[in-house]
Interface confidence: low
Amino acid sequence: DAHKSEVAHRFKDLGEENFKALVLIAFAQYLQQCPFEDHVKLVNEVTEFAKTCVADESAENCDKSLHTLFGDKLCTVATLRETYGEMADCCAKQEPERNECFLQHKDDNPNLPRLVRPEVDVMCTAFHDNEETFLKKYLYEIARRHPYFYAPELLFFAKRYKAAFTECCQAADKAACLLPKLDELRDEGKASSAKQRLKCASLQKFGERAFKAWAVARLSQRFPKAEFAEVSKLVTDLTKVHTECCHGDLLECADDRADLAKYICENQDSISSKLKECCEKPLLEKSHCIAEVENDEMPADLPSLAADFVESKDVCKNYAEAKDVFLGMFLYEYARRHPDYSVVLLLRLAKTYETTLEKCCAAADPHECYAKVFDEFKPLVEEPQNLIKQNCELFEQLGEYKFQNALLVRYTKKVPQVSTPTLVEVSRNLGKVGSKCCKHPEAKRMPCAEDYLSVVLNQLCVLHEKTPVSDRVTKCCTESLVNRRPCFSALEVDETYVPKEFNAETFTFHADICTLSEKERQIKKQTALVELVKHKPKATKEQLKAVMDDFAAFVEKCCKADDKETCFAEEGKKLVAASQAALGL
């Protein structure tokens, strides 16, 4: 339904508080280097303008599209050329090309300082002095570092952030109350950002059909009692929501997400029995809860799939009449019966089924040709099952840190051209699959593990896309969304790689390592491990283990020494020499 003024419509639907927060997120995700104060000023100007349109929808410029209004506002930033370089050229374009141009300049790895957490008393004082500014700053800092963060979900994080400070700044032991909550929000926030980044990559790189297929599979697993028509409606609406958010249309996205949550709750009887509690919550919590809701129980006595999709004489007729609908029904029926499969596996099975029908429906005897199609699924199902079994055994044997190290070595040998920080970040996250998923029973392991790995490998893909250095990474990232993980798994050691020159500076450590947190210290050691492999890609596990054990002992010894700096200088030289000898460098 058309509105005379889109900005007035969204302001009224969302309310002033959410409107301002979402505009701030949108601006910070586009202009990631701009100071906080500049963004607040722009947001206030947009908000004042929106209010004039609410008062009179016919007022000047109120009929303009949100992209036009927001783009015009962003293009008033005086330092656009100096700060952003060629992004300033976007401002010479007309809509919709201007918005597309801004989107293309979003930076997944912006050159911004690491967020350092101040002392608890300092944070509490800032919170009490100006709660509104404090919370806006949170939105701004997260949004500019995560330019694809799911905006309505960021509002939910901000609400929890506020709740944590409201409670803990009154507590007897503020730090004991607040710090675990902030750690939890940080970790959940990173996970949420990565999950949304995969959704946007799916839409932007592989198109709406790929996203819809993913959504059909996931929603069918989650809502197995819902009819196919109901799942299809939810998929259409969910696709619209994520297309909007990934496209920078955050006001429309938040508004449509609220409508979708409302629809789901009004129709929960025909969707899922697990939604009751979610639907009693306020909007932000409700939407979050629905997105995370557990799978409903499968209906009893579901018939065999073979009847409709293999044995029926009408398979080719049904397929020809409406290919995507028929494949959607196949995916729906398979997914609702298999909450134990990962979404990407279900999509591989659907792709295999599609390929078989394309081939067989043109054959002389179609039925004879596709009669054994389900047999083709067996190896596809067994591959992730075996891989997860092996890796969970390795994780249980090694523990998280050493399991991460094993993956670091494995992935550095596969794609040694990738930057060391990216290899460390991605391998650490890949290693977290162990503690996240291996504790689950068999029936939950695969959806947990393989769908999580899809999210992590997407991080590698988007970081690599910014500075491509490896044809193998490009190939695995671009050829097939659902086969990314099998593609990376299948990579062997890169025999074409020329080892890096040895540089002693890379392995020089100082006393500052002693004051780092355990996590930061691990990252230092893992960085050294990646560099070692880049110098000596043919080093054996045993050789690398010996060097890393020596390195750990060296750090521990020097951190206990009276004169730490001297110890690091002298013992460090010895360690480098011993490591060179051990690895034959």
Epitope: K159, R160, A163, T166, E167, C168, C177, K281, P282, E285
Partner: nanobody
Framework: QVQLVESGGGLVQPGGSLRLSCSAS????????MGWYRQAPGKGLELVAS???????HYADTVKGRFTISRDNSKNMVYLQMNSLEPEDTAVYYC?????????WGQGTQVTVSS
């Protein structure tokens, strides 16, 4: 460990009033929902009234205009003012508080409306 304690129940004549209170002890943060549920003999649990973090309220059709829910954020307290009580309101009334970490219930307080 969070504990909820209800008070204020009792025997009252039709047309009378009662005020139920529920207090939360222990560490509870980020509350987004406080509510009162009731269970009459031989019946299921039904939501009577709820109040969200922004103060918006929701009432069962059977109590609209007679019952009022309110909360005191600073004390983690939730109240239910019940006026014009009817025999059909006889039930055990339970307090429910939800936060980001979980869903907490009290033991219940008996309300009996009888002449």
């Amino acid at each position: 460990q969070v504990q909820l304690v209800e008070s204020g129940g009792g025997l009252v004549q039709p047309g009378g009033s009662l005020r139920l209170s529920c207090s939360a002890s222990g560490s509870i943060w980020g509350i987004y929902h406080m509510g009162w549920y009731r269970q009459a003999p031989g019946k299921g649990l039904e939501l009577v009234a709820s109040i969200t973090v922004d103060g918006s309220t929701h009432y069962a059709d059977t109590v609209k205009g007679r019952f009022t829910i309110s909360r005191d954020n600073s004390k983690n307290m939730v109240y239910l003012q019940m006026n014009s009580l009817e025999p059909e309101d006889t039930a055990v009334y339970y307090c429910d508080i939800r936060n980001v970490g979980g869903d907490y219930w009290g033991q219940g307080t008996q309300v009996t409306v009888s002449s």
